[in-house]
Interface confidence: low
Amino acid sequence: GITIPRNPGCPNSEDKNFPRTVMVNLNIHNRNTNTNPKRSSDYYNRSTSPWNLHRNEDPERYPSVIWEAKCRHLGCINADGNVDYHMNSVPIQQEILVLRREPPHCPNSFRLEKILVSVGCTCVTPIVHHVA
Amino acid sequence: GITIPRNPGCPNSEDKNFPRTVMVNLNIHNRNTNTNPKRSSDYYNRSTSPWNLHRNEDPERYPSVIWEAKCRHLGCINADGNVDYHMNSVPIQQEILVLRREPPHCPNSFRLEKILVSVGCTCVTPIVHHVA
């Protein structure tokens, strides 16, 4: 019977776990042709809960570069341009799928991986814990 | 520059088409074991730019269910709990990778697809266009 390539150390599609290993065409189809990527590019600066973007690079991951948002302040920017600590800047997080090279350094063998990334920040009313 | 040596146990791939078709193990490795998924679950309600979450389901996509944020107001919620139209609620969007079944209905053949999703909303100072 046929198995997916089984050079030493390479993945194999075991019948028992099928379809554990699937074939993926990496020619990315981009559904975002009508969107302007710059449309939200300045929100990080104009937000009342501004953030900085940090480059997270990992050659063993696809995509290898992911941008992580870090909120600039614990509080939020008020109308006077000052930080108001009665409010909180919090990261909006999302679980995303990435491909992790497995075994390491293989150009065309991956495992699906779920990672949590911070996309931006929003300003929320803090939860106040009252002492009984 | 440094090149990481290719693992000799990697599946074969012709350079000409490399790496159009790759093997992907769908047993998801979750790096988020220490994160509490509920941690940010109420931000959508507590934010000064609150949002609703809409379920987007597509059986031909992996993951098949994606939650899309829609800002509730054009403006932001002020300290009095009213909508302040001097500020704007805007969606924070992110490009994410999903797997699209190709050909349709195939259980184990996919194409990588990039889609734009709204993760949440943030409150920004509006850009005021002055008339000359």
């Epitope: 019977g1 046929i2 997916i4 390539p5 019948d15 028992k16 099928f18 379809p19 699937v22 074939m23 020619n27 | 599946p11 074969n12 791939s13 012709e14 000409k16 088409n17 159009r20 078709t21 190709e102 050909p103 349709p104 209905h105 195939c106 259980p107 184990n108 053949s109």
Partner: antibody, heavy 118, light 110 residues
Framework: EVQLLESGGGLVQPGGSLRLSCAAS????????MSWVRQAPGKGLEWVSA????????YYADSVKGRFTISRDNSKNTLYLQMNSLRAEDTAVYYC???????????WGQGTMVTVSS | NFMLTQPHSVSESPGKTVTISCTRS????????VQWYQQRPGSAPTIVIF?????PSGVPDRFSGSIDSSSNSASLTISRLKTEDEADYYC?????????FGGGTKLTVL
């Protein structure tokens, strides 16, 4: 080891019917789509029909649509091809194949001969 | 439906390299995987290349597959030819609801 064993072939008159079976072993049958491919004497390969692992989706070549029915019994690890209104041009060796992915026949049986002649 | 066109026959000497082409009549070849099957006389076909360029275990690295989107064609290349490579070779592709084989190419190792 994957094994596919076809049976049910034979001589049949034009307009007649025949039911082919394919007994599968060595793998989790219900996890795989299965196909029938035929080869007329001295000719090339021709895809006939395919069925999803659950049996919920079936596909047919235009040349057999409406006459042939593919089905499977996952409890018996068996694939079937019910052939009605047979014609002389249906004469061929019929192979059962396990699909690696849709449209990719990864493992093949040895085939069963079907002869349609008066 | 589309068709896959292959040369009827090719021949080459042992130790040499031979390439068999397969052209898709309509629909982009790049959108669907191409497979190659080997069939020796009196035997069932066996897959030698799947998903354009992937080799199943047990298939020698002398066999390689490629596609050329500009000509909408696929190729099977066999290097360091051996007498045991003499067989019929079929390319195969598909659409979302049907599967199509090429007419086959008879490879003669002189």
């Amino acid at each position: 080891e994957v094994q596919l064993l076809e049976s049910g072939g034979g001589l049949v008159q034009p307009g007649g019917s025949l039911r082919l079976s394919c007994a599968a072993s060595g793998f989790t049958f219900s996890s795989y789509a299965m196909s029938w491919v035929r080869q007329a004497p001295g000719k090339g390969l021709e895809w006939v029909s395919a069925i999803s692992g659950s049996g919920g989706s079936t596909y047919y070549a235009d040349s057999v649509k409406g006459r042939f029915t593919i089905s499977r019994d996952n409890s018996k690890n068996t694939l079937y091809l019910q052939m009605n209104s047979l014609r002389a041009e249906d004469t061929a060796v019929y192979y059962c194949a396990r699909d690696l992915i849709w449209g990719v026949a990864g493992s093949w049986g040895q085939g069963t001969m079907v002869t349609v002649s008066s | 439906n589309f068709m896959l066109t292959q040369p009827h026959s090719v021949s080459e000497s042992p130790g040499k390299t031979v390439t068999i082409s397969c052209t898709r009549s309509s629909g982009s070849l790049a959108n669907y995987y191409v497979q190659w099957y080997q069939q020796r006389p009196g035997s069932a076909p066996t897959i030698v290349i799947f998903a354009n360029n992937q080799r199943p275990s047990g298939v020698p690295d002398r066999f390689s597959g490629s596609i050329d989107s500009s000509s909408n064609s696929a190729s099977l290349t066999i290097s360091r030819l051996k007498t045991e490579d003499e067989a019929d070779y079929y390319c195969q592709s598909y659409s979302p609801s049907s599967v199509v084989f090429g007419g086959g190419t008879k490879l003669t190792v002189l």
